[in-house]
């Protein structure tokens, strides 16, 4: 076994002077790592494991079907052939992938974890990391796209299809890199003293990085949406002085606030507990993080199930397309733009622009 010489003292063992060369444990069983992290490695299916697996598989199926429906709807309806919808389709693809990754996890969890090798365990975690990063990166891209359109007073960005493809490629490249980082080296296979409790083959430092990376992304999204909301409020207030329709403006503002609260609220509810738990795993030795881990992972996964609802089901045009697909109805005019084609903008776009412009056809 290759040993790398180091003179760095082992932080987790401060009462001793460590001068050992760390060894690598690529050929060890998963039990070896779990036994050293203090994480329980189940030998049989208990009630909690069965419940988590049952619920997990149900959520997976819903995630895959709901997101597949979003992708199909955007593909079949020409009215959705705009950058925001391509990003929504990509978000759906990321969430679909999250469903697949979680599905793989469900069949390699509980007592089945014992059968995994170091490589397959890292693959299992890598798939989840990749899918969740892609999902979060997409949410951020949508927030940026909304920010650009609102501040340029457009219904849709004038971003070319090529640029959208570049954004999508960047999202997936970033997601794959983030998912692959632990597999290519940022793990504790050669640093056994610094393995985390929650993910026994991952380094403490990676968990902290992963949690902070996602929390920072979340803060950026909050800032972007807060800026959008502040701008729209400013515009509507200015307009209400020169217009006879303050009620409409207030309704528009409330509709926007509602959407933003749903978007951010879902993100906070689904992600924060898991990310905080990762930080507590490293920073709070007395906290029993392992007791909540499964449920918080499930909660984070729920975000992938909720995204189609939040971003798509609030859109009347999208709902109509869903009904057409599910009921196998033929669309009256699925390919060409119609007089009301601009109304296919997301409710977020629609409400912003309704408050900013006197009619929502003024900018395309």
């Amino acid at each position: 076994m290759a040993a790398i010489s180091t003179s760095i003292p082992v932080i987790s063992q401060p009462q001793f002077t460590a001068m050992n060369e760390p060894q690598c444990f690529y050929n060890e069983s998963i039990a070896f790592f779990y036994n050293r992290s203090g994480k329980h490695l189940a030998t049989e299916w208990n009630t909690v494991s069965k419940l988590v697996m049952g619920l997990g598989i149900t959520v997976c199926i819903f995630i895959m079907l709901a997101n597949l429906l979003v992708m199909v709807a955007i593909y079949v309806n020409r009215r959705f052939h705009f950058p925001i919808y391509y990003l929504m389709a990509n978000l759906a693809a990321a969430d679909f992938f999250a469903g697949l990754a979680y599905f793989y996890l469900m069949f390699n969890t509980g007592p089945n974890t014992r059968r995994l090798t170091v490589s397959t365990w890292l693959l299992r975690q890598g798939l989840i990391d990749t899918s969740l990063t892609a999902s979060v990166a997409n949410l951020l891209a949508i927030a940026i796209e909304r920010h650009i359109t609102v501040f340029r007073m457009q219904l849709h960005t004038r971003m070319s299809n090529r640029r959208v493809v570049v954004v999508i490629v960047v999202i997936w490249t970033m997601a794959i890199v983030m998912g692959a980082i632990p597999s290519v080296g940022w793990n504790c296979i050669c640093d056994i003293e610094n393995c985390s409790n929650m993910a026994p083959l991952y380094s403490d430092s990676y968990l902290v990085f992963w949690a902070i990376f996602n929390l920072v992304t979340f803060v950026v999204m909050v800032v972007l949406y807060a800026h959008i909301f502040g701008y729209v409020r400013q515009r509507t207030m200015r307009m209400s002085r020169h217009s006879s329709g303050p009620r409409r403006n207030r309704d528009t503002m409330m509709s926007l606030l509602k959407t933003v609260v749903i978007v951010l609220g879902a993100f906070i509810i689904c992600w924060t507990p898991g990310l905080v738990l990762l930080l507590l795993d490293v920073c709070c030795p007395q906290c029993d993080v392992l007791a909540y881990e499964k449920f918080f992972l499930l909660l984070a996964e729920f975000n992938s199930a909720m995204n189609p609802i939040i971003y798509s089901y609030r859109d009347k045009e999208m709902s109509a397309t869903f009904r057409q697909i599910l009921c196998c109805q033929r669309s009256e005019n699925p390919t060409g733009p119609t007089e009301g084609s601009d109304r296919s903008a997301s409710s977020l776009n629609h409400t912003i622009l309704a408050g900013v412009h006197s009619n929502d056809h003024s900018v395309v």
């Epitope: 987790s12 009462q15 444990f25 036994n35 050293r36 203090g38 329980h40 003293e193 409790n197």
Partner: antibody
Framework: QVQLQQSGAELARPGASVKLSCKAS????????ISWVKQRTGQGLEWIGE????????YYNEKFKGKATLTADKSSSTAYMELRSLTSEDSAVYFC???????????????WGTGTTVTVSS | DIHMTQSPASLSASVGETVTITCRAS??????LAWYQQKQGKSPHLVVY???TLTEGVPSRFSGSGSGTHFSLKINSLQPEDFGIYYC?????????FGAGTKLELK
């Protein structure tokens, strides 16, 4: 300083049960695993099992499964070991020992209790 | 289970001498080996862990070596307080096993 205070000697009848305690002080109890080790008079050391109070996870030597049950009370920073269906073979000194590293299990022990003598006699 | 074989079973030495105790594991345990010293009627005391790392407060005359299956504990210039029984223990993972012990006595 870091200490493990064990309960006093026990005299028990064959078939009976005893519950030994190990009170920890001088450190964060939940951060370190506690193992139990058996030593018969003039004999070597035998590992019984370990409890990790942070999660409540327990690890047992197959030989002692069904014989020993390990528990921990976080509020009183005390680890317990219950021995049941006692026989003369269970007469020994039982030590509790603390893991040398926190937040994970290194499976070596830097702090030991003074030991509890269990005598099984009819 | 991993079986630990210690040798010699007993050893007589004088103050100032150098002694070596060996321990063999039935399978590869990397560097996961600890050495304990136990005096009559007392609790064991951790001397070395990870095969070669000395516990804080242990004099530098003690040194551990080895990896894989063969390990040794060397005590240079024996002092009166060094006499007692020495046990090796693998800390690869459960179930943990100890060697039968080496009794180091004053000649």
């Amino acid at each position: 300083q870091v200490q493990l205070q064990q309960s006093g000697a026990e005299l028990a009848r064959p078939g009976a049960s005893v519950k030994l305690s190990c009170k920890a002080s001088g450190y964060t109890f939940t951060s370190y695993g506690i193992s139990w080790v058996k030593q018969r008079t003039g004999q070597g050391l035998e590992w019984i099992g370990e409890i990790y109070p942070r999660s409540g996870n327990t690890y047992y030597n197959e030989k002692f499964k069904g014989k020993a049950t390990l528990t921990a009370d976080k509020s009183s920073s005390t680890a317990y070991m219950e021995l049941r269906s006692l026989t003369s073979e269970d007469s020994a000194v039982y030590f509790c020992a603390r893991e040398s590293i926190s937040r994970r299990l290194g499976w070596n022990f830097d702090v030991w209790g003074t030991g509890t003598t269990v005598t099984v006699s009819s | 289970d991993i079986h630990m074989t210690q040798s010699p079973a007993s050893l007589s030495a004088s103050v100032g001498e150098t002694v070596t105790i060996t321990c063999r594991a039935s399978e590869n345990i990397y560097s996961f080996l600890a050495w304990y010293q136990q005096k009559q009627g007392k609790s064991p005391h951790l001397v070395v862990y990870n095969a070669k790392t000395l516990t804080e407060g242990v004099p530098s005359r003690f040194s551990g070596s080895g990896s894989g299956t063969h390990f040794s504990l060397k005590i240079n210039s024996l002092q009166p307080e060094d006499f007692g029984i020495y046990y090796c223990q693998h800390h690869y993972g459960p179930p943990l096993t100890f060697g039968a012990g080496t009794k180091l006595e004053l000649k």
